[in-house]
């Protein structure tokens, strides 16, 4: 009779994470008697995967009924595969020994490779907002994929970016890998509605890449432009002065009127109008009683936007002369403005 051989016909098996791996093994003879065991790895540190004789292996099932007479098929299935299961699996025949079984013959091994999908890319921007013309960095991270080969691209509003650096870790062999990429983006005043997209392509995704997005609205700060104008007389001795706050983002804005350096009113932007580019406009007016002033009046519109240092614009109101019409505003810009009489 020929000596038993352990046959593992598959040199390698590739399985997607979450699926079941079938590791094939047959013996060429029923003797010598003794159990089959499956191990991951070789040598003293090898990990027992299945023992025909005893033990509880909840993820492992045998392909054939190992209790059947004359069985020579010792193939196993391992369920719910994860990248941590990758490695070389050996089917090993033991011979009955006293007191312990003796390793008799091993199969050549089957390398199990696990294809694991990358996690959804997470894009994060800078901690603080930045203003147009500044360059900001965005990071993109995705984890848990295998094999190591992966492609990452950056887009801004559908246009591919080129200024980025990408690392895949670890450099050496691993059960799974992570990718980290940093892209540099120059902000423009029109970027409130812009998106930065990180796109990850991997063999497990069947040509349908994963995308992570970041809205530049979370990153950009567009500072306002101020214009103070004097409106036509409303009534004898009254002048209407408006402060137009244009093209700002985000909406958080506080406006203070100063008369000759003294605070006369403070208000918070509420009913704003939105521009096509996502920035906001707002207008505040001040009704000044000219007869209450003997000297010329310096009116200042002071705006604190998004916690930044205040910016201001001033307008000199001549008390001696009869007020002239010094500008006009559309009805839309007056909508929602606040009107107060100052005495």
């Amino acid at each position: 009779e020929e000596e038993l051989q352990v046959i593992q016909p598959d040199k390698s098996v590739l399985v997607a994470a979450g699926e079941t791996a079938t590791l094939r093994c047959t013996a060429t003879s029923l003797i010598p008697v003794g159990p089959i065991q499956w191990f991951r790895g070789a040598g003293p540190g090898r990990e027992l995967i299945y023992n025909q004789k005893e033990g509880h292996f909840p993820r492992v099932t045998t392909v054939s009924d190992l209790t059947k007479r004359n069985n020579m098929d010792f193939s196993i299935r391992i369920g719910n595969i994860t990248p941590a299961d990758a490695g070389t699996y050996y089917c090993v025949k033991f011979r009955k020994g006293s007191p312990d079984d003796v390793e008799f013959k091993s199969g050549a091994g089957t390398e199990l490779s696990v294809r694991a999908k990358p996690s959804a890319p997470v894009v994060s921007g800078p901690a603080a907002r930045a203003t147009p013309q500044h360059t900001v960095s965005f990071t993109c991270e995705s984890h848990g994929f295998s094999p190591r080969d992966i492609t990452l691209k950056w887009f801004k509003n559908g246009n591919e970016l080129s200024d980025f650096q990408t690392n895949v870790d670890p450099v050496g062999e691993s059960v799974s890998y992570s990718i980290h990429s940093t892209a540099k983006v120059v902000l423009t005043r029109e970027d409130v509605h812009s998106q930065v997209i990180c796109e990850v392509a991997h063999v497990t995704l069947q040509g349908d890449p994963l995308r992570g997005t970041a809205n530049l609205s979370e990153t950009i700060r567009v500072p306002p432009t101020l214009e103070v104008t004097q409106q036509p007389v409303r009534a004898e001795n009254q002048v209407n002065v408006t402060c137009q706050v244009r093209k700002f983002y985000p909406q958080r804005l506080q406006l203070t009127w100063l008369e000759n350096g003294n605070v006369s009113r403070t208000e918070t932007a509420s009913t704003v109008t939105e521009n096509k580019d996502g920035t906001y406009n707002w207008m505040s007016w001040l009704l000044v009683n000219v007869s209450a002033h003997r000297d010329d009046v310096k009116l200042t519109c002071q705006v604190e936007h998004d916690g930044q240092p205040a910016v201001s614009k001033s307008h000199d109101l001549k008390v001696s002369a009869h007020p002239k019409e010094q500008g006009s505003n559309t009805a839309a810009e007056n909508t929602g403005s606040n009107e107060r009489n100052i005495y």
Epitope: E1, E2, A27, S29, L30, I31, V33, G34, P35, Q52, K53, E54, G55, L66, T67, K68, R69, N70, N71, M72, K96
Partner: antibody
């Protein structure tokens, strides 16, 4: 240590019934086929029958099929032999046995010490 | 059923000599390239103990003086050299198919 221990033997009248037990220890009982073998005084060995791990297959020697019932309780690690309509020729030492090492090639390498059944009026 | 006929029924052998016990099957017990024939030793008051499985393979812990041979329908168990401890009953058994059957036994004694 792999052990089998039979119990339940004793004196039984002809036509009567008796249930033998075999308690297994030292191995994963639920994975193994189990057999009953008997030996009449001064005689040879006779295989009675066997049961597979999940009780879905039970084989008997044809002449004993209608008299004996083999069962098992894996939760209790115990094999049973229900004997009925016993006759004097059923007087014997009853062994339980298994093929512990030969799962593919089959032979009895583990035996209990046996329990004696005497059929007499 | 496969019937196993053992011979001789009893045998006396001098210490140090060779004892040969034969077993003939009513039909071949070969399958899968091996012979499904086993040999057991039984001493008084003890259960049987396997000596040889698959015609020629020694059981674990069995002394080398016990050997088996044969195929198909004709098998033999050899004990050489005979020792005092070998006094016992010897049985052949086929495990090719159900019902498993045993030979009638051979009583081996020291001459």
């Amino acid at each position: 240590e792999v052990k089998l221990l039979e119990s339940g033997g004793g004196l039984v009248q002809p036509g009567g019934s008796l249930k033998l037990s075999c308690a297994a220890s030292g191995f994963d009982f639920s994975r193994y086929w189990m057999s009953w073998v008997r030996q009449a005084p001064g005689k040879g060995l006779e295989w009675i029958g066997e049961i597979n791990p999940d009780s879905s297959t039970i084989n008997y020697t044809p002449s004993l099929k209608d008299k004996f019932i083999i069962s098992r309780d894996n939760a209790k690690n115990t094999l049973y032999l229900q004997m009925s309509k016993v006759r004097s020729e059923d007087t014997a030492l009853y062994y339980c046995a298994t093929s512990f090492y030969g799962s593919s090639y089959w032979y009895f390498d583990v035996w209990g010490a046996g329990t004696t059944v005497t059929v007499s009026s | 059923d496969i019937v196993l006929t053992q011979s001789p029924a009893s045998l006396a052998v001098s210490l140090g000599q060779r004892a040969t016990i034969s077993c003939r099957a009513s039909e071949s017990v070969d399958n899968y390239g091996i012979s499904f024939m086993n040999w057991f030793q039984q001493k008084p008051g003890q259960p049987p103990k396997v000596l040889i499985y698959a015609a020629s393979n020694q059981g674990s812990g069995v002394p080398a003086r016990f050997s088996g041979s044969g195929s198909g329908t004709d098998f033999s168990l050899n004990i050489h050299p005979m020792e005092e401890d070998d006094t016992a009953m010897y049985f052949c058994q086929q495990s090719k198919e159900v019902p498993y059957t045993f030979g009638g036994g051979t009583k081996l004694e020291i001459k």
